[in-house]
């Protein structure tokens, strides 16, 4: 029961996490520029991985996509790649984990197969979460190291004078969404891996001694229904009948006088 709960909770946590990673990737507020005041209107500038937006105090908002790939910073491309890899891995992990859920019966799927699928999805969730955390952290590092900060400069040339005002970008909401979502996906993955250990069938190697009445030459050997990983002598989970009772460790030996009561 605890295994099912752990697996189910891991799935739900990962599902929320991946939904968060998708949301963060699509969000425009990865970085926000400090409020830019001017004599006309307050302008709020913010950027995402795919487009840049400007909002005026009047409420007017304009967003434009990055239609070029060549002019984009390599770091931005790397962040995009990490987030997409995280989403893809997470989506595959979700698909695998659905079939791995203990509460869902699909044909005659054995527990060992479900355990393997649970472990696979768990690893996928962990990698997915790490990708998201890495992507968000790389972007945050760009902001911290003043990648977005323009240096105050003024020069004259063709077309006049440009004054690049000291404006600074700060962390946008998407970064926090990404960190939390990545963390949740990571936790969900760990839970799935823990659940996998409980799902994996273990060999219960008891010394099974069978008894039968002296008037009969057939002995019932208990232990036929024990959990097996295929390493024991009774891999087919059948009732074993033979001429005398034997322990599991004495399958090859002949009956002796000690076998009978």
């Amino acid at each position: 029961m605890a295994v099912t709960a752990c697996q189910g909770l891991g799935f739900v946590v990962s599902l929320i996490g991946i939904a968060g990673i998708i949301a963060a990737t699509c969000m425009d507020q990865w970085s926000t520029q400090d409020l830019y005041n001017n004599p006309v209107t307050a302008v709020f500038n913010y950027q995402g991985l795919w487009r840049s937006c400007v909002r005026e105090s009047s409420g007017f908002t304009e967003c434009r996509g990055y239609f070029t790939l060549l002019g984009l910073p390599a770091m931005l491309q790397a962040v995009r790649a990490l987030m997409i890899v995280g989403i893809v891995l997470g989506a595959i992990g979700l698909l695998v984990s659905i079939f791995a859920l203990k509460c869902i019966r699909i044909g005659s799927m054995e527990d060992s197969a479900k355990a393997n699928m649970t472990l696979t999805s768990g690893i996928m969730f962990i990698v997915s979460g790490l990708c998201a955390i890495a992507g968000v952290s790389v972007f945050a590092n760009m902001l911290v190291t003043n990648f977005w900060m323009s240096t105050a400069n003024m020069y004259t040339g063709m077309g006049g004078m440009v004054q690049t005002v000291q404006t600074r970008y700060t962390f946008g909401a998407a970064l926090f969404v990404g960190w939390v979502a990545g963390g949740l996906t990571l936790i969900g993955g760990v839970m799935m891996c823990i659940a996998c250990r409980g799902l994996a069938p273990e060999e219960t190697n008891y010394k099974a001694v069978s008894y039968h009445a002296s008037g009969h030459s057939v002995a019932y050997k208990p232990g036929g229904f024990k959990a097996s990983t295929g390493f024991g002598s009774n891999t087919k989970n059948k009732k074993i009948y033979d001429g005398g009772a034997r322990t599991e460790d004495e399958v090859q030996s002949y009956p002796s006088k000690h076998d009978y009561v």
Epitope: N45, S52, G59, F60, E62, Y66, W148, S150, T164
Partner: nanobody, 121 residues
Framework: QVQLVESGGGLVQPGGSLRLSCAAS????????MTWYRQALGKEREFVAG???????NYADSVKGRFTISRDNSKNTLYLQMNSLRAEDTAVYYC???????????????WGQGTLVTVSS
């Protein structure tokens, strides 16, 4: 980079009219706000009028009712219609744009070289 080129300045009699233009060119990603400033000889640069892409406009008290600012977003061009000109309107008029040359770059202040408007009889 974003280049701004002003035109339309010249000599005009008091009470006359002029229309200034400012054309933005270059690697423009977005220009949220465009403004006109002026600087008279020996004085500090002062705000005249400005307009945002959303249509919000603002005027200095000294030009209200006389000057009209407009912009053509499709052409990235700013206009200033100046009526009932006075001698104190004599100055070099500068075009200013708060723009980003690339989407991931911060908004920056870009300035034109200015156009001279002389109001004299």
């Amino acid at each position: 980079q974003v280049q701004l080129v002003e035109s339309g300045g010249g000599l005009v009699q008091p009470g006359g009219s002029l229309r200034l233009s400012c054309a933005a060119s270059g690697s423009i990603f977005s220009i949220p706000v465009m403004t006109w400033y002026r600087q008279a000889l020996g004085k500090e640069r002062e705000f005249v009028a400005g307009i945002s892409k959303g249509g919000t406009s603002n005027y200095a008290d000294s030009v209200k009712g006389r000057f009209t600012i407009s912009r053509d977003n499709s052409k990235n061009t700013l206009y200033l219609q100046m009526n009932s000109l006075r001698a104190e309107d004599t100055a070099v008029y500068y075009c200013n744009a708060q723009a980003s040359s690339f989407g991931w770059m911060p908004l920056s202040d870009y300035w034109g070289q200015g156009t001279l408007v002389t109001v004299s009889s």
